[in-house]
Interface confidence: low
C-alpha cells in the first residue's frame, strides 16, 4: 500500500500547533485511503528545506527567496503549489517588483547612478534585493559592505532599517531610518510617499503600492515605471516593465520521488473543507497564536505548479539574476560593451553537428548548448542557460508565451534589400499522392496523417486548428486512424507510423525519421495518405533535388494539394490551393539579449549566409542538405522585423487567434508553465 | 561558488616547455567553459586560450601552434601544455572559469584563481 502521508515541516512551537490541528482536522473530513498529514518540527526554515531534501518530510510553505535556496544543490526541491490571493476567479500567485517614478523626470534604469532612491526598508525584496540584486554589477567596487556601495551609487536614500551611523546616506531622505511606520518612508506606501513628496527620483515598490496610494487615474498617470530594457511606460503596464515577478508563498518538494501529486491532492481537499469561509472550527488560513503559521492569513487557496516547472522558471530569469548577484558577489572583471558570444540552442545531434562546426567558424561569436526538444530549448533561454535559436511560428508563440521575443525572420525569397523586407509568410498545404484520387479535405477522417510534429505552424497548428473546428474536439488520434506527429504521446495512433528506433520513436528532433518536413514528406512517400507541410516541400524533395535514396528518383508530378473547397489542385498551383498562410520561422531570444543576437546573427550571415558560393568546401550557414538543421535550409536571409518585434505583432492577430483556440487541445507542458506564470 | 586552484608555474629556459593545471571545486556543474589568462606586469590580463565544454577552444594568436589547452571534465581540470616558451611568455597565469548559471543580466560570472608565476629565462 503507498503511504499516502504527507509530512509536513514546522518552525515554531505555534506552526506545529496548528499543523497538529490540520492534521486531526483533515481525518475527520478525509477516507482512510485519502492523504494524511503528519507533523515534523525543526528550528528553521532552512532546517525544514534540508529535512526535505533527506527525506525526513515532504512538504514546507516557503517566501520566494528561500524557494531560491530550496532549488540551489545539494537541496534541489521544486514548488509544487502556489498560495493565491485576490479571487478564484483572479487568482493572484505573484507580485511585480517595479520601480517608480514621475512622469516629468528624464532618465532611463541604466541613469540611475547619482539620483536620489526610496527603498521600502533593508534586506526587503521589492524595495532592495531586488533592485539592488540587479544594480549589482553596476555599483562601485569594493562592493562589500553592500550598503556603502549604494549609499555611493545613489546621491541619497531612504532605506528604512538600514544603519544610520554608519551609512548616513542610506537615511539622508528620512532622517533615522526608522524600521517601522513611525518612520512615514517605511513600507510600501512609504516608499511611494517619499517619491511623491519630491524627496526621491525613484521609489522601489510593488505594482500594487501606487494603485493603493492613488486611487484617481489622473493622479497615476504623473508616474510611469522603469523597464530594464532602458525605456519607460505607464503604471498599469507592470507585466510588461518590472524589475522581476516573485512569486508570494509556495509550497516545495523533492524533485524526484517528491509527492507533488500527493501534496496537492491533500492541499485541494483541505482548501474545499477548510479554505476561505469554509469552516469555523478550523480555518487553513488563519492564525489564532500568531501570523502566517503554515500559510499567509491572506492566502485564498491554492493553485497546482504545472510539473514541466522548476525553481528557475518558477522564480524567472530576473529575479533569480539579482538574488545569484547578491548572494554570490561576483561580477565580470571588467564588464565591456562587446557582446558576449551568443549560445545557440541545438536540437539532439544532428543540429549538434552542425552548430559545432559554425561555433568554430564563427571564432568565439557563436557557442552550442544541446537540447532534447524544442521546448527544453526554448526553457533552456529563458533562464539563461542558452541564447538563441530558430523557430517555426508554433514555438515563436510559445516562446512568447515564455517571455521570449522574435528578433529577425528568415526569409525564403531572394530579393535585393533581403534583409531590409521581412515577408508575408509561407503556404501551409496538404499534400496527397495523386494516385489516391478519390481523396478530398472532406473525407480525410479513418486516413493515414503525416505531420512536421505537434505544436508546429504548417504540420499541426494551422491543419489541426481547421479540423478543430469541424470536429470539435480534440481527439485527433481518433480522427485519423494512425500517423505521425513527433510529439505526440508514445501509445498514441499518432505515433503509429513513424520510424524511430527505440526511444528515438515519435520524437520532436532529427533521430525521428520522419520529423519535420522533409520527414513528414517522407512519411507520405512510404506510408501516409495526406501529408501537412509548407508549400516548397514537394518541389525541394523531387527531381533529385534530395539525393537520399528514398527521396532521388520521386517526381513533383506524381503529388498533389487538398484544397478547403473539397478539390485537388497541382503543387505548383499553392497560390490557390492552401490551408493558410504561416508565419516564417524566426530566431528568438531573451529580451535582454535582443541587441546582440541581432549584432551577432547580421554579422554570421555576412560571413556565411546565402552568399557563399561553394558549401562543399565552407560552412554554410543555411545549408543541410534538407535537414533544416538550425535554420530551414531555403533561408536566403535573416530579416530585420522593424516593428514586429513582440511574438504577437510578428505572428499577426489571425494566426495567434487560431493557436489560441487550439491550446484547449495543447500537450505543451512548458506553454502551461509559462501561462501560470503569465495567464 | 566555484574555487580553482593553480599549479604548475616556475622557471624555465626558452624554448622549454610547462604544463598548468587548474582544479576546480565547489559548484562545478555550474561551469560552461574553463581557460586561462595572463599578466605581465604593466600589462593588462589578456586571454591566452579557453575551452568550452562542448569542446571549443579559443587561442591568442601569440600562442597558436605552442599552447595546447584540454579538459578532464571528470575530473574538473583544465591543463595548459606551453611548448617552445619565450621570454615574453613571462607572467602570472590565472586559471578562469565561467559560470553558465543565470548571473548579471547579458554577462556570465567568472571565477578567478590566484595565479602562478611563470618565468622564461633567455
Known amino acids: 500500500v503507498p503511504d499516502k502521508t504527507v509530512r509536513w515541516c514546522a518552525v515554531s512551537e505555534h506552526e506545529a500547533t496548528k499543523c497538529q490541528s490540520f492534521r486531526d482536522h483533515m481525518k475527520s473530513v478525509i477516507p482512510s485511503d485519502g492523504p494524511s498529514v503528519a507533523c515534523v518540527k525543526k528550528a528553521s526554515y532552512l532546517d525544514c528545506i534540508r529535512a526535505i531534501a533527506a527525506n525526513e518530510a515532504d512538504a514546507v510553505t516557503l517566501d520566494a527567496g528561500l524557494v531560491y535556496d530550496a532549488y540551489l544543490a545539494p537541496n534541489n526541491l521544486k514548488p509544487v503549489v502556489a498560495e493565491f490571493y485576490g479571487s478564484k476567479e483572479d487568482p493572484q500567485t505573484f507580485y511585480y517588483a517595479v520601480a517608480v517614478v514621475k512622469k516629468d523626470s528624464g532618465f532611463q534604469m541604466n541613469q540611475l547612478r547619482g539620483k536620489k532612491s526610496c527603498h521600502t526598508g533593508l534586506g526587503r525584496s521589492a524595495g532592495w534585493n531586488i533592485p539592488i540584486g540587479l544594480l549589482y554589477c553596476d555599483l562601485p567596487e569594493p562592493r562589500k559592505p553592500l550598503e556603502k556601495a549604494v549609499a555611493n551609487f545613489f546621491s541619497g536614500s531612504c532605506a528604512p532599517c538600514a544603519d544610520g551611523t554608519d551609512f548616513p546616506q542610506l537615511c539622508q531622505l528620512c532622517p533615522g531610518c526608522g524600521c517601522s511606520t513611525l518612520n512615514q518612508y517605511f513600507g510600501y506606501s512609504g516608499a511611494f510617499k517619499c517619491l511623491k513628496d519630491g524627496a526621491g527620483d525613484v521609489a522601489f515598490v510593488k505594482h500594487s503600492t501606487i494603485f493603493e496610494n492613488l486611487a484617481n487615474k489622473a493622479d497615476r498617470d504623473q508616474y510611469e515605471l522603469l523597464c530594464l530594457d532602458n525605456t519607460r511606460k505607464p503604471v498599469d503596464e507592470y507585466k510588461d516593465c518590472h524589475l522581476a515577478q516573485v512569486p508570494s508563498h509556495t509550497v516545495v518538494a523533492r524533485s524526484m520521488g517528491g509527492k507533488e501529486d500527493l501534496i496537492w491532492e491533500l492541499l485541494n481537499q483541505a482548501q474545499e473543507h477548510f479554505g476561505k469561509d469554509k469552516s469555523k472550527e478550523f480555518q487553513l488560513f488563519s492564525s489564532p497564536h500568531g501570523k502566517d503559521l503554515l500559510f499567509k492569513d491572506s492566502a485564498h487557496g491554492f493553485l497546482k505548479v504545472p510539473p514541466r516547472m522548476d525553481a528557475k522558471m518558477y522564480l524567472g530569469y530576473e529575479y533569480v539574476t539579482a538574488i545569484r548577484n547578491l548572494r554570490e558577489g561576483t561580477c565580470p572583471e571588467a564588464p565591456t560593451d562587446e557582446c558576449k558570444p551568443v549560445k545557440w540552442c541545438a536540437l539532439s545531434h544532428h543540429e549538434r553537428l552542425k552548430c559545432d562546426e559554425w561555433s568554430v567558424n564563427s571564432v568565439g561569436k557563436i557557442e552550442c548548448v544541446s537540447a532534447e526538444t524544442t521546448e527544453d530549448c526554448i526553457a533552456k533561454i529563458m533562464n539563461g542557460e542558452a541564447d538563441a535559436m530558430s523557430l517555426d511560428g508554433g514555438f515563436v508563440y510559445i516562446a512568447g508565451k515564455c517571455g521570449l521575443v522574435p528578433v529577425l525572420a528568415e526569409n525564403y525569397n531572394k530579393s535585393d534589400n533581403c534583409e531590409d523586407t521581412p515577408e508575408a509568410g509561407y503556404f501551409a498545404i496538404a499534400v496527397v499522392k495523386k494516385s489516391a484520387s478519390d481523396l478530398t479535405w472532406d473525407n480525410l477522417k479513418g486516413k493515414k496523417s503525416c505531420h512536421t510534429a505537434v505544436g508546429r505552424t504548417a504540420g499541426w497548428n494551422i491543419p489541426m486548428g481547421l479540423l478543430y473546428n469541424k470536429i470539435n474536439h480534440c481527439r485527433f488520434d481518433e480522427f485519423f486512424s494512425e500517423g505521425c506527429a513527433p510529439g505526440s504521446k508514445k501509445d498514441s495512433s499518432l505515433c503509429k507510423l513513424c520510424m524511430g528506433s527505440g526511444l528515438n520513436l515519435c520524437e520532436p528532433n532529427n533521430k525521428e525519421g520522419y520529423y519535420g518536413y522533409t520527414g513528414a514528406f517522407r512519411c507520405l512517400v512510404e506510408k501516409g495518405d495526406v501529408a501537412f507541410v509548407k508549400h516548397q516541400t514537394v518541389p525541394q524533395n523531387t527531381g533529385g533535388k534530395n539525393p537520399d535514396p528514398w527521396a532521388k528518383n520521386l517526381n513533383e508530378k506524381d503529388y498533389e494539394l487538398l484544397c478547403l473547397d473539397g478539390t485537388r489542385k497541382p503543387v505548383e498551383e499553392y497560390a490557390n490551393c492552401h490551408l493558410a498562410r504561416a508565419p516564417n520561422h524566426a530566431v528568438v531570444t531573451r529580451k535582454d539579449k535582443e541587441a546582440c543576437v541581432h549584432k551577432i546573427l547580421r554579422q554570421q550571415q555576412h560571413l556565411f549566409g546565402s552568399n557563399v558560393t561553394d558549401c562543399s568546401g565552407n560552412f554554410c550557414l543555411f545549408r543541410s542538405e534538407t535537414k533544416d538543421l538550425l535554420f530551414r535550409d531555403d533561408t536566403v536571409c535573416l530579416a530585420k522585423l522593424h516593428d514586429r518585434n513582440t511574438y504577437e505583432k510578428y505572428l499577426g492577430e489571425e494566426y495567434v487567434k487560431a493557436v489560441g483556440n487550439l491550446r484547449k487541445c495543447s500537450t505543451s507542458s512548458l506553454l502551461e508553465a509559462c501561462t501560470f506564470r503569465r495567464p | 561558488q566555484v574555487q580553482l586552484v593553480e599549479s604548475g608555474g616556475g622557471v624555465v629556459q626558452a624554448g622549454g616547455s610547462l604544463r598548468l593545471s587548474c582544479v576546480a571545486s565547489g559548484s562545478v556543474f555550474s561551469i560552461d567553459a574553463m581557460g586561462w589568462y595572463r599578466q605581465a606586469p604593466g600589462n593588462q590580463r589578456e586571454l591566452v586560450a579557453a575551452m568550452t565544454n562542448a569542446g571549443s577552444t579559443n587561442y591568442a594568436d601569440s600562442v597558436k601552434g605552442r599552447f595546447t589547452i584540454s579538459r578532464d571534465n571528470a575530473e574538473n581540470t583544465v591543463y595548459l601544455q606551453m611548448n617552445s616558451l619565450k621570454p615574453e611568455d613571462t607572467a602570472v597565469y590565472y586559471c578562469?572559469?565561467?559560470?553558465?548559471?543565470?548571473?548579471?543580466?547579458?554577462?556570465?560570472?567568472?571565477?578567478w584563481g590566484q595565479g602562478t608565476q611563470v618565468t622564461v629565462s633567455s
Open positions: 578562469n572559469a565561467r559560470s553558465k548559471l543565470i548571473a548579471r543580466i547579458n554577462n556570465p560570472y567568472e571565477y
